[in-house]
Amino acid sequence: EPTMYGEILSPNYPQAYPSEVEKSWDIEVPEGYGIHLYFTHLDIELSENCAYDSVQIISGDTEEGRLCGQRSSNNPHSPIVEEFQVPYNKLQVIFKSDFSNEERFTGFAAYYVATDINECTDFVDVPCSHFCNNFIGGYFCSCPPEYFLHDDMKNCGVNCSGDVFTALIGEIASPNYPKPYPENSRCEYQIRLEKGFQVVVTLRREDFDVEAADSAGNCLDSLVFVAGDRQFGPYCGHGFPGPLNIETKSNALDIIFQTDLTGQKKGWKLRYHGDPMPCPKEDTPNSTWEPAKAKYVFRDVVQITCLDGFEVVEGRVGATSFYSTCQSNGKWSNSKLKCQPVDCGIPESIENGKVEDPESTLFGSVIRYTCEEPYYYMENGGGGEYHCAGNGSWVNEVLGPELPKCVPVCGVPREPFEEKQRIIGGSDADIKNFPWQVFFDNPWAGGALINEYWVLTAAHVVEGNREPTMYVGSTSVQTSRLAKSKMLTPEHVFIHPGWKLLEVPEGRTNFDNDIALVRLKDPVKMGPTVSPICLPGTSSDYNLMDGDLGLISGWGRTEKRDRAVRLKAARLPVAPLRKCKEVKVEKPTADAEAYVFTPNMICAGGEKGMDSCKGDSGGAFAVQDPNDKTKFYAAGLVSWGPQCGTYGLYTRVKNYVDWIMKTMQENSTPRED
């Protein structure tokens, strides 16, 4: 227990102390007091450095004194022979004697008392940063005006934290600037700007004077800037050592000013402002930026436009431009959007043609359409080559985005007709010689295919049956063979408006305008046994001259049979109309004079008994095209005749080309257009 005073006597005092003794006393007075130890009697064997016998006074690890020998007071008014004053509240006294004493020594008598210490003056280290106040048993620290005592109750500092700056521009300085800043302080300032603005700090070198760094380069007083996970500083010294313009890239900045106990410097002053957050000028491939600027900042909006042939795609739709905003985080909105090559997609297929699978369908790629040769050709030109254009369409230099149209090649038989074996009035033929030949089964007649949807025939063939059944592609018209050939279904029959309809057709003597068109429900697929015949051109080249040869074909009456089962054909010359008029009508149904002959009729035949006959009606009189010897055109249609095996009359197709074209045009589907 600490005591305020006490007495310490050597063993056996005042008798002689024994040999070989070691005894210690621990003195403790209350906290806040020092110890005054004084000896009133001292009689201990003397030796050099008190090596034999001694009384030792120890404070902590320090020996305050070591006594031996005899002492007497110098002051007649005081009994004290030796005294010690320590500013600590603990002291140890140790007495030692060796194995022999040459004389009789009586030892010592000592007393201790607790004494007040002045903590403010008695120590090398001053306990208070500013004002120290001593009292009995202790002290307290106090501070000058505008300072406050820290929690350690020793250090004073200034209250310079807690300020939050939100204005877009401002000035901040150390406390008392330009007078010396307070020591032993930590000042924290916060700048908090609207998102999208970065704090920019500007200082002048001369506005900065902070206690310099120590020999190791550590700042004793320091100014530090903290922006998110970035730190600028610590800074100290005379004149600002850092960059005079600090772009923090953040809308929040903490400024921390830390000072120690010493120093008399003026401190610092800075300005700050909010700069709109910059966004990087990004290199976006295949696009242009508008407006183009050297620097983009928060809230700037740019229109990014893809170069021709590039687009931004989302799902199945695309756009050629978009907007991007410089955002509060310094990044562009819509940065995911990239201009990529336009994809024209898999090219559309075309009827009767094909397109090779493209290696690529992206902008700039090239594809080629071809028609199914030799039966189809590209009607609308352009060569069939298309490139993927910037608008996402496959484009041809001539046709633009319009697709090529593969239309049947007309008038070219796969095998030319040769009169092989001479039979009466004609030869056997193969359908490949006359692929345009159409067979009508009721009435038994013929027709000529002129394109995918239309059959040309004589009006008298269809006047009694507006829904004829027709076949193509077969040489034989035996029922078993017809079952395997292509049957054509009519959609509508168009009889020439100049054809006079009679109540008793058998008595007809006027075959003027004996022409009709049959519109088919479905298109005909062309091939070696099915392909159309050409129509005559409108130029004078297509005016027939006497002696011009033409081919007729059909399954009509022959010398031997009323109907042929296999296709027959003959080559006939064109004859003057009078030759037909001169032939006596076989089994006339009226006076010979009643039969009408018009310029709409062609007379042909008269050679070797070759002629068309009943059952051949509507078939083509095919003449070689004067402008393209590889092709045949339908110069005439088998119409009527005075007598089989002589001369026959054929509808002059050239006179009806306008009507044919108009009728087909007015009754076509959009697909055909």
């Epitope: 809230r299 909006v301 739709v317 978009f322 907007y323 990044k331 909105s333 819509n334 995911k336 959007l337």
Partner: antibody, heavy 116, light 107 residues
Framework: QVQLVQSGAEVKKPGASVKVSCKAS????????MHWVRQAPEQGLEWMGW????????IYAQKFQGRVTITADTSTNTAYMELSSLRSEDTAVYYC?????????WGQGTLVTVSS | DIQMTQSPKSLSASVGDRVTITCRAS??????LDWYQQKPGQSPKLLIY???YRYSGVPSRFSGSGSGTDFTLTISSLQPEDFATYYC?????????FGQGTKLEIK
């Protein structure tokens, strides 16, 4: 096909927080922005913010700043929206939506009711 | 923030009618404007993007026009399934803002 499936309805007390999930299928969320839009009863649509799941960048409408947190878990292809300090006026249907050029696909919506 | 104002707030029309809804932006949004349709209890559906482009699968009776601050959504011939609420939205700059909506009701 593209689908956004949101978590079920929630009832919360004022002051609490709510976290709504939006599970995407048929596409990778890293290739798109994921937005959150809310609609109070009988009211219009209100954009709250978006996330770029590729780098976790977010932008929030000023009105919700500090209260809303949008996150994304690319491993599960899911976006989340957490709204804290709920008040009664936060009662609404919350939608997630996917965009690049526009909000082409939307979740079915999650009704959050805030009531004491 | 950019404010979007739609007019009218609501309108009644009959099947077959031609209907026009307008949307005005408080500042220039160029062509960064989309239109959405929302039916009760359903999520919004995109109709028109970039002011005038019809989204895939949207009937041709819906069309959009305008640029800058004034935009129009037109339904050329109303069908029974078109009765809904229509919203415009600017995507020119964040925050992306919606109009307050136009409720199209059957007369």
């Amino acid at each position: 096909q593209v689908q956004l499936v949101q978590s079920g309805a929630e009832v919360k007390k004022p002051g609490a927080s709510v976290k709504v999930s939006c599970k995407a299928s048929g596409f990778n969320i890293k290739e798109y922005y994921m937005h959150w839009v809310r609609q109070a009863p009988e009211q219009g649509l209100e954009w709250m913010g978006w996330i770029d799941p590729e780098n976790a960048d977010t932008i929030y409408a000023q009105k919700f700043q500090g209260r809303v947190t949008i996150t994304a878990d690319t491993s599960t292809n899911t976006a989340y929206m957490e709204l804290s300090s709920l008040r009664s006026e936060d009662t609404a249907v919350y939608y997630c939506a996917r965009s690049r050029l526009f909000f082409a696909y939307w979740g079915q919506g999650t009704l959050v009711t805030v009531s004491s | 923030d950019i404010q979007m104002t739609q007019s009218p707030k609501s309108l009644s029309a009959s099947v077959g009618d031609r209907v026009t809804i307008t949307c005005r932006a408080s500042q220039d949004v160029r062509t960064a404007l989309d239109w959405y349709q929302q039916k009760p209890g359903q999520s919004p559906k995109l109709l028109i993007y970039s002011a005038s482009y019809r989204y895939s699968g949207v009937p041709s009776r819906f069309s959009g026009s305008g640029s800058g601050t004034d935009f129009t959504l037109t339904i050329s011939s109303l069908q029974p399934e078109d009765f809904a609420t229509y919203y415009c939205q600017q995507q020119y700059t964040t925050p992306y803002t919606f109009g307050q909506g136009t409720k199209l009701e059957i007369k």
